[in-house]
Interface confidence: medium
């Protein structure tokens, strides 16, 4: 069957069911109703599916049984609505049952919570992980997803199914070392921070396509896939950034079977086609189906073709420009589009579109001048500004970055970003200062050649963390005019921004400064985030800080911590040396 | 050698339908996008609609979208193009022609069948 072309099934759910199998079915359907409804209790939800399953089996038995030509809205919706506690536990959530489909499922997609109000994940002892994996090993695997569906509401479905595949095997090998602890706990600490990165990566695209359009994401789609394919014509670049757009406008839109179902066809297809895509597909197309779509997903660029012609010639020279994009805008700039990603596998994907855009701009004014050709011959040197803009920040921030490490380099971005930003959460301002300070050890080892794809990427997706965070609960115009102005200009937004001048310092509160001998149990992450927790705090009640006063309570606030943790009495110290270390960062602050 | 051959123009009113069929043969039609393009009496070439080897996806130049529509049978070796609702600004020479690699030029086309558009 041709890609994305089929039949009309009588059954949606028969189809999707036979499609993907029981098991994947089943993992799919309780990742879409975890992602819905994050506070209902997992028993509570392997109850709905297993009803919804029951189902579906018995449309694949008889097609037009009852029910069975209904829309997976239809049938998913009514089944969520069946919930008893809907009411009481969602509030107006509730209210979207009174819809009748589309607006139904828009309306559970608008209250997905990026934020929920869940505890923190604790890991329990290995033995006590092993017993539970041992005594019932498909319950466990399913709690993982719905543990991670219902924390992360935007995550990459069938992308879960394949980490839940890595989880399993963790288990099924470290229960049975000699020592489960140093097998295991490695590995679910990767499974953790890839599945961070993975959830944050996702919801960029979610985000770029709910808040500005299938066109933006199909932009950033040519200009990555050009980058990562570019010996692959224009018209299979496009054909494949067509169907990935369905692929994750299904998934960002809460129809996870579509989703994966329409991946495996979009990995079969590409693996079918490599010959016309990339060199570097071949081990990938090898391995199993969910290991093949992530491997795809990941596969590094191919070369650039060695005899690509100037761009200029095309784009610039050719007395057809204006031609060629009255014709067809978006296909002329998609081929602009293109051309420039795949030459350039160094400049970063949001680059690439701020050129792109650039050049629509020009031909918009050119293309209505009296001397269309002359107006716009000069357009590549207006790329060359912003072009050197990431490339100077990049080099200045891996030099601070060399220079102070990376929990010194993270300081330095939450005192930044509170100056910039201070009515946002501390709680959030730690959080994605602590992410942008990764770019840091993520990014600056690689040559410069890879640095800024690498950088100013991963930096639109934690400015994304932001984005959506504040969304919840906005209080900073700056914030929201940066999220909201432009998808490819969030980054220079952000670095733009000056101190916050309007801002009225926060009143000074002793009981935030007040530490407990429980600081001292905390593993070296978490004590951290409590000092960065009271950088951030600082910086609001003293904005016009300098980078000396901050650096000198710190370092005071460190050795307090140290001291008091190394006490016999350790309450009695933190309690008595608390009191002076407030009393003197008062002091050294001017408070 | 590499052969396209272009037929089912003619003369047709304002508003009327006609179908385009493209025969090609001596490359490998089911690994190649197509697309059509259009020459009036003493203008330039316009590209009209591009086909995916598939078959999906499609595009349209603005002046036809929603009013023509591209397709191919691989099994056929052939390319198609239904144009509804015509006007008398369709009225050119249709070529249909290999889509090319990457840069705007086109590798090869036929020798183009003409519709005329006309009260």
């Known amino acids: 069957r041709g890609v994305f072309r089929r039949d009309a099934h009588k059954s949606e759910v028969a189809h999707r069911f036979k499609d993907l199998g029981e098991e994947n079915f089943k993992a799919l359907v309780l990742i879409a109703f975890a992602q819905y409804l994050q506070q209902c209790p997992f028993e509570d939800h392997v109850k709905l599916v297993n009803e919804v399953t029951e189902f579906a089996k018995t449309c694949v038995a008889d097609e037009s049984a009852e029910n069975c030509d209904k829309s997976l809205h239809t049938l998913f919706g009514d089944k969520l609505c069946t919930v008893a506690t809907l009411r009481e536990t969602y509030g107006e959530m509730a209210d979207c049952c009174a819809k009748q489909e589309p607006e139904r499922n828009e309306c559970f997609l608008q209250h997905k919570d990026d934020n929920p109000n869940l505890p923190r994940l604790v890991r329990p002892e290995v033995d006590v992980m092993c017993t539970a994996f041992h005594d019932n090993e498909e319950t466990f695997l399913k709690k993982y997803l719905y543990e991670i569906a219902r924390r992360h509401p935007y995550f990459y479905a069938p992308e879960l199914l394949f980490f839940a595949k890595r989880y399993k095997a963790a288990f099924t090998e470290c229960c049975q070392a000699a020592d489960k602890a140093a097998c295991l706990l490695p590995k679910l600490d990767e499974l953790r921070d890839e599945g961070k990165a993975s959830s944050a990566k996702q919801r960029l695209k979610c985000a770029s396509l709910q808040k500005f359009g299938e066109r933006a994401f199909k932009a950033w789609a040519v200009a990555r896939l050009s980058q990562r394919f570019p010996k692959a014509e224009f018209a299979e670049v496009s054909k494949l950034v067509t169907d990935l757009t369905k692929v994750h406008t299904e998934c960002c839109h809460g129809d996870l079977l579509e989703c994966a179902d329409d991946r495996a066809d979009l990995a079969k297809y590409i693996c079918e086609n490599q010959d016309s895509i990339s060199s570097k597909l071949k081990e990938c197309c090898e391995k199993p189906l969910l290991e093949k779509s992530h491997c795809i997903a990941e596969v590094e660029n191919d070369e650039m073709p060695a005899d690509l012609p100037s761009l200029a010639a095309d784009f610039v020279e050719s007395k057809d420009v204006c031609k060629n994009y009255a014709e067809a805008k978006d296909v002329f700039l998609g081929m602009f589009l293109y051309e420039y990603a795949r030459r350039h596998p160094d400049y970063s994907v949001v680059l690439l579109l701020r050129l792109a855009k650039t050049y629509e701009t020009t031909l918009e004014k050119c293309c209505a001048a009296a001397d269309p050709h002359e107006c716009y011959a000069k357009v590549f040197d207006e790329f060359k500004p912003l072009v050197e803009e990431p490339q100077n920040l990049i080099k200045q921030n891996c030099e601070l970055f060399e220079q102070l490490g990376e929990y010194k380099f993270q300081n330095a971005l939450l005192v930044r970003y509170t100056k910039k930003v201070p009515q946002v959460s501390t709680p959030t301002l730690v959080e994605v200062s602590r992410n942008l300070g990764k770019v840091g050890s993520k990014c600056c080892k690689h040559p410069e050649a890879k640095r800024m794809p690498c950088a100013e990427d991963y930096l639109s997706v934690v400015l994304n963390q932001l984005c959506v965070l504040h969304e919840k609960t906005p209080v900073s115009d700056r914030v929201t005019k940066c999220c909201t102005e432009s998808l490819v200009n969030r980054r220079p937004c952000f670095s733009a921004l000056e101190v916050d001048e309007t801002y009225v310092p926060k009143e000074f509160n002793a009981e935030t400064f007040t530490f407990h001998a429980d600081i001292c149990t905390l593993s070296e992450k978490e004590r951290q985030i409590k000092k960065q927790t009271a950088l951030v705090e600082l910086v609001k009640h003293k904005p016009k800080a300098t980078k000396e006063q901050l650096k000198a309570v710190m370092d005071d606030f460190a050795a307090f911590v140290e001291k008091c943790c190394k006490a016999d009495d350790k309450e009695t110290c933190f309690a008595e040396e608390g009191k002076k270390l407030v009393a003197a960062s008062q002091a050294a602050l001017g408070l | 050698e590499v052969q396209l051959l272009e037929s089912g123009g003619g003369l047709v009113q304002p508003g009327g339908s006609l179908r385009l069929s493209c025969a090609a043969s001596?490359?490998?039609?089911?690994?190649?996008?197509m697309l059509w393009v259009r020459q009036a009496p003493g203008k330039g070439l316009e590209w009209v609609s591009v086909i995916h080897q598939s078959g999906t996806p499609t595009y349209y130049a603005d002046s036809v979208k929603g009013r023509f529509t591209i397709s191919r049978d691989n099994s056929k070796n052939t390319l198609y193009l239904q144009m509804n609702s015509l006007r008398a600004e369709d009225t050119a020479t249709y070529y249909c022609?290999?889509?090319?690699?990457?840069?705007?030029?086109?590798?090869?086309w036929g020798q183009g069948t003409l519709v005329t558009v006309s009260s």
């Open positions: 022609a290999k889509f090319p690699s990457s840069r705007m030029k086109f590798d090869y």
């Open positions: 001596g490359f490998t039609f089911d690994t190649s996008s």
